[in-house]
């Protein structure tokens, strides 16, 4: 049988995905970090 | 408040095309997840769902009666319309049409009925 | 078609005393969304049906709390914790995760 038709079950939650690169000066390389949600989370 | 209402005639001939209409308030065809359904009742017996339309025109029809049924909408007039053609006295029902909204903040239910029409399939 | 078989058909019941009808589906009802689409309407004599109880067991808004509604699968059942005069009418359950939307054959509810 052909489903009905419904929502998805789930709710999708849209937050915003920043990457960003802060130069350390004197220090070897450069820190590289994914900010999600406000959360540094790499 | 929401509230629907069926119209049609109370009588129609075998072999004949019935068209009834439900015209709605508190609510518009026009909100995203919303759409409207008929269903029947033929006297003492159990309710059989007929068809359902959406706010975005999308339309589902019980297979059994698909080839007889046609749906659609008018959303500025606050009205749905349901046709059956080729009329037989097993057609002989009170006629329903309720709301359904999808949604996963809506109860996802026919949660508003109308009173209902009773339409007479007879010679 | 999932047909939706109930039982029992009639049910007497005396006022304050506990009701449960059963509600059974040909097939599993759940959704590929992994939602159930069971409800439960009431017909009261002479009344346009009215939900009562959607996706199984949620309450509809003004439904009193003495409904419930439980299952999964293809086995539901309605409980009325206490009848009361009011409840009279026929209960259909309803499924509507497949088309065509299927409804059992109905319960009538009477007062002993």
């Known amino acids: 049988d052909a489903e009905f038709r419904h929502d998805s079950g789930y709710e999708v939650h849209h937050q915003k995905l920043v990457f960003f690169a802060e130069d350390v000066g004197s220090n070897k390389g450069a820190i590289i970090g994914l900010m999600v949600g406000g959360v540094v989370i790499a | 408040q929401v509230t629907l209402k069926e119209s049609g005639p109370a009588l129609v001939k075998p072999t004949q095309t019935l068209t009834l209409t439900c015209t709605f308030s508190g609510f518009s065809l026009s909100t995203s997840g919303m759409g409207v359904g008929w269903i029947r009742q033929p006297p003492g017996k159990a309710l059989e769902w007929l068809a359902h339309?959406?706010?975005?025109?999308?339309?589902s029809y019980n297979p059994s009666l698909k080839s007889r049924l046609t749906i659609s909408k008018d959303t500025s007039k606050n009205q749905v319309v349901l046709t059956m053609t080729n009329m037989d006295p097993v057609d002989t029902a009170t006629y329903y049409c309720a709301r359904r909204q999808l949604g996963l903040r809506s109860i996802d239910a026919m949660d508003y009925w109308g009173q209902g029409t009773t339409v007479t399939v007879s010679s | 078609d999932v047909v939706m078989t109930q039982s029992p058909l009639s049910l007497p019941v005396t006022p304050g005393e506990p009701a449960s009808i059963s509600c059974r589906s040909s097939q599993s009802i759940l959704h590929s969304n992994g939602n159930t689409y069971l409800e439960w309407y009431l017909q009261k004599p002479g009344q346009s049906p009215q939900l009562l109880i959607y996706?199984?067991?949620n309450r509809f808004s003004g439904v009193p709390d003495r409904f419930s509604g439980s299952g999964s699968g293809t086995d539901f059942t309605l409980k009325i914790s206490r009848v009361e005069a009011e409840d009279v009418g026929v209960y259909y359950c309803?499924?509507?995760?497949?088309?065509?939307?299927?409804f059992g054959q109905g319960t009538k509810l009477e007062i002993k």
């Open positions: 339309i959406w706010w975005d025109d999308d339309k």
């Open positions: 309803m499924q509507s995760s497949f088309v065509p939307l299927t």
């Open positions: 996706k199984v067991s």
